[in-house]
């Protein structure tokens, strides 16, 4: 919401994840086999067809370095709650190794578990809605947001304590992730910081900051998955 | 369990300055604001003011911004109040109290001002 | 300044009786209203707040309604535990404000 469409494949590891051929979340190629995106994206996809799309820009035109691929195995957090924006992470092995290249590349993450400093710039990438009207663009967008201190988050005006050390936030003030960005990377310095929450909040609005699931937090469990 | 817990009573005279300390444990300190409330004899709440333990970014009524000062110390997670040049108005219970999820107060606590 | 102006002052009611104190602020504070309760000698505690949500652990006979200026905290039986004074409190805009109380005595 807010942003500007991204440069074509200057983020390589951009996914998007899908189910039945349709956009559905944001995801992040964190090594050759998978993708790292959010619980709850999966939580209404019951018996459908999930699939990573790897090496885009646009959604529907032809481009030389996109690949659908098959999921092997979808690994939810252990303690993702369909209730709950806790632990709303999600690891999917594609069917094979991805092929790397150019538009299709892993992207570090963090493991060091501190804080990024608040007003931090961070980039946050997606094929969600760009406006109120729910408009979904075809081609990859992108907005760079402040990050935002915990304490002034967990105000009652905001998200009323509910913002763990395990989740950060980032400034809303009508630039934002919405709808359909869940799942997707916040990237902050080159470094995978924080993963877009798939909880309903509304976009847009400045007392209701973007919320972001930690990676460093949960080091030891995406190990863990991958080894 | 969260706890917050405040200095003793405290005597002073007019002109003078007090601290007030609220020690707070059972959760991260720098996760959220503190802020200041306070309640004169047989009268309603007053607030005070607010301090982001991160940042250490303040919010005052304007009544006490002249007078009051708020600090924290985050390496004993603590958050103080100093209210200087005193008078009998100030005579109070001051409460400290988290902003954000449940409403955690401390137990108060008394300043006299009297010559 | 927003002004919360509560009402009534104090009240007499018996235990079961249904009891409703009222809060107007003086301008629009969308839902961001708590409401604190409050016994001798003691700090307040919290019972509701964005104008309708219960703390845990309060019972189910306190909840609290309204948006914009005009907000309501029921107690919909009165317990015996329940008699003391009540504060609303706005926390949309700077300097937070609290209404001047209202004391729920046994009558």
């Known amino acids: 919401l807010g942003g500007r469409e991204a440069e074509a494949h200057a983020r390589p590891y951009m996914a998007s994840v899908q189910l039945n051929g349709a956009h559905l979340c944001g995801g992040v190629l964190v090594a050759e086999q998978w993708v790292l995106s959010a619980a709850h994206c999966l939580e209404d996809a019951a018996d459908g067809k999930v699939q990573v799309l790897l090496g885009a820009h646009s959604l529907s035109q032809p481009e030389p370095s996109k690949r659908l691929y098959d999921v092997l195995r979808a690994v939810p957090h252990p303690d993702s709650q369909p209730d709950t924006i806790d632990h709303d992470l999600l690891l999917l092995q594609l069917s094979e190794k991805a092929t790397l290249g150019p538009a299709v590349r892993p992207l570090p993450w963090q493991r060091v578990d501190r804080d990024v400093a608040p007003g931090t710039l961070c980039d946050v990438a997606g094929w969600g809605i760009v406006n109120h009207a729910g408009r979904r663009p075809d081609s990859l967008q992108h907005v760079l947001l402040p990050v935002l201190d915990r304490a002034t988050c967990n105000r009652r005006t905001h998200h009323d304590g509910a913002i763990t050390e395990r989740l950060m936030c980032a400034e809303s003030n009508r630039r934002d992730s919405c709808k359909g960005d869940s799942g997707g990377p916040l990237v902050c310095g080159g470094v995978l910081e924080g993963v877009v929450t798939s909880g309903s909040r509304v976009c847009g609005n400045r007392k209701k900051p973007g919320i972001y699931t930690r990676v460093a937090s949960y080091a030891a469990w995406i190990d863990s998955v991958l080894a | 369990e969260v706890q917050l817990v405040q200095s003793g009573a405290e005597v002073k005279k007019p002109g003078a300055s007090v601290k007030v300390s609220c020690k707070a444990s059972?959760?991260?300190?720098?996760?959220?604001?503190m802020y200041w409330v306070r309640q004169a004899p047989g009268q309603g709440l007053e607030w005070i003011g607010e301090i982001n333990p991160t940042s250490g970014d303040t919010n005052f009524n304007e009544k006490f911004k002249s007078r009051a000062t708020l600090t924290v110390d985050t390496s004993t997670s603590t958050a103080y109040l100093e209210l200087s040049s005193l008078r009998s108005e100030d005579t109070a219970v001051y409460y400290c109290a988290r902003e954000g999820g449940f409403a955690y107060w401390g137990q108060g606590t008394l300043v006299t001002v009297s010559s | 300044d927003i002004q919360m102006t509560q009402s009534p002052s104090s009240l007499s009611a018996s235990v079961g009786d249904r009891v409703t104190i009222t809060c107007k602020a003086s301008?629009?504070?969308?839902?961001?209203v708590a409401w604190f309760q409050q016994k001798p000698g003691k700090a307040p505690k919290g019972l509701i707040y964005?104008?309708?949500s219960r703390y845990s652990g309060v019972p189910s006979r306190f909840s609290g309604s309204g948006s914009g200026t005009d907000f309501t905290l029921t107690i919909s039986s009165l317990q015996p535990e329940d008699f003391a004074t009540y504060y609303c409190?706005?926390?949309?805009?700077?300097?937070?404000?609290f209404g001047q109380g209202t004391k729920v005595e046994i009558k």
């Open positions: 409190q706005q926390y949309n805009n700077y300097p937070l404000t």
């Open positions: 301008q629009n504070v969308d839902t961001d």
């Open positions: 059972g959760y991260t300190f720098t996760s959220y604001y």
């Open positions: 964005s104008a309708s």
